[in-house]
Amino acid sequence: QNASRGRRQRRMHPNVSQGCQGGCATCSDYNGCLSCKPRLFFALERIGMKQIGVCLSSCPSGYYGTRYPDINKCTKCKADCDTCFNKNFCTKCKSGFYLHLGKCLDNCPEGLEANNHTMECVSIVHCEVSEWNPWSPCTKKGKTCGFKRGTETRVREIIQHPSAKGNLCPPTNETRKCTVQRKKCQKGERGKKGRERKRKKPNKGESKEAIPDSKSLESSKEIPEQRENKQQQKKRKVQDKQKSVSVSTVH
């Protein structure tokens, strides 16, 4: 802001001069500027205990410019407003107030919520999620072979995160138990997990069958053809051991 203070040079009436410095049109020793040149705004500037008139090219924060014929003045925004376009339209509220449609409010109206970052009343945003992605393959301990019962997972994305008062997001992951036609793992399918783990027998009381999940869409009942007797199991284990030493027990 370009400020100019008056200094009397030519007496016109007691304490009033038209021979002023800078932007003043009329001025006095005691009061500074009394009126301003065209397009400049009159404002009171506090200097210690005293207020003197100054002429500014733009108004300071907390004020807006009012224009009347040949009289421009900086006029105070409302008490709760930091910057304003005019007396009735605030553009930034003072601390503790929220801006809504040019007004400064203690609390936001129904259906809106306070954004404490922008200090504005904003629409409540509810969570939005995408459709579920397809179910993942049925796996157990990261493998898709060498077992009969495992789990499968599906996910969905959050499209819109909720605002403070918005509805929370529903789960974005779903897991369910699944059963597969038990098949032997091929050599290439055994992956790191299989090679790194030591072969171990199931602990006493450890179930080989997963408890069916009520959510599971597939039946967990075994078909008789899928059963193997103990002799066949033993036989297979010996054969597997001969093929590769790195096979781990199927749980």
Epitope: S35, G53, K76
Partner: antibody, heavy 119, light 107 residues
């Protein structure tokens, strides 16, 4: 010493136009702001409007459609015209000078002239 | 428009009394307030402008104070020539508006 003197007819008929002139001495109407204020008998003061040093005018919106403020710089005079008057416009009309926001408002006043609206 | 509510509308006081007249604006007028004295049949006379500045030649017993919406004119020791009607005027924005006036009468 700045002096302002109002002049004009003291009686105006309803629906006619009230015309007053303020003659200024000791100052030029090409500087500052020159105002009209009125006061109905026994009542308070009402601001009417001004004409500026450049000849631009402001009229109180409550009177805007009826009020005209003009000037004659050669005579150092400014005038008020108020059309379609009624009994409610009966008042003492004052002209007054002001320098700007930083100075005394209406530092100088005329003595006032009573205008009665009556048939 | 900004409304100016002046009180009291009248008061009775004796010479030597301290008299206080108040003016309340309908919104913050940022110190743009003047006080006038008017005697019967005369034009108003400006006493104070910008809330607390005395016009040259006005006795120092007159003083003004206030800020925001609330303003006060004080006559510290009432003199016989002070019996008159007093008006406040805001000039924060146009149209300017006056208070309704306070008549100070002899008790």
């Amino acid at each position: 010493e700045v002096q302002l003197v109002e002049s004009g007819p003291g009686l105006v008929k309803p629906s006619e136009t009230l015309s007053l002139t303020c003659t200024v001495s000791g100052d030029s109407i090409t500087s500052g702001y020159w105002n009209w204020i009125r006061q109905p008998p026994g009542k308070g003061l009402e601001y009417m409007g001004y004409i500026s040093y450049s000849g631009k005018t402001y009229q109180n919106p409550s009177l805007k459609s009826r009020i005209t403020i003009s000037r004659d710089t050669s005579k150092n005079q400014y005038s008020l015209k108020l059309s379609s008057v009624t009994a409610a416009d009966t008042a003492v009309y004052y002209c007054a000078r002001y320098y700007g926001y930083g100075g005394p408002w209406f530092a100088y006043w005329g003595q006032g002239t009573l205008v009665t609206v009556s048939s | 428009d900004i409304q100016m509510t002046q009180s009291p509308s009248s008061l009775s006081a004796s010479v030597g009394d301290r008299v206080t007249i108040t003016c309340k604006a309908s919104q913050d007028i940022d110190s743009y307030l003047s006080w006038f004295q008017q005697k019967p049949g005369k034009a108003p006379k400006t006493l104070i402008y910008l809330t607390n500045r005395l016009v040259d030649g006005v006795p120092s017993r007159f003083s003004g104070s206030g800020s925001g919406q609330d303003y006060t004119l004080t006559i510290s020791s009432l003199q016989p020539e002070d019996f008159a009607t007093y008006y406040c005027l805001h000039y924060d924005e146009f149209p300017l508006t006056f208070g309704q006036g306070t008549k100070v009468e002899i008790k």
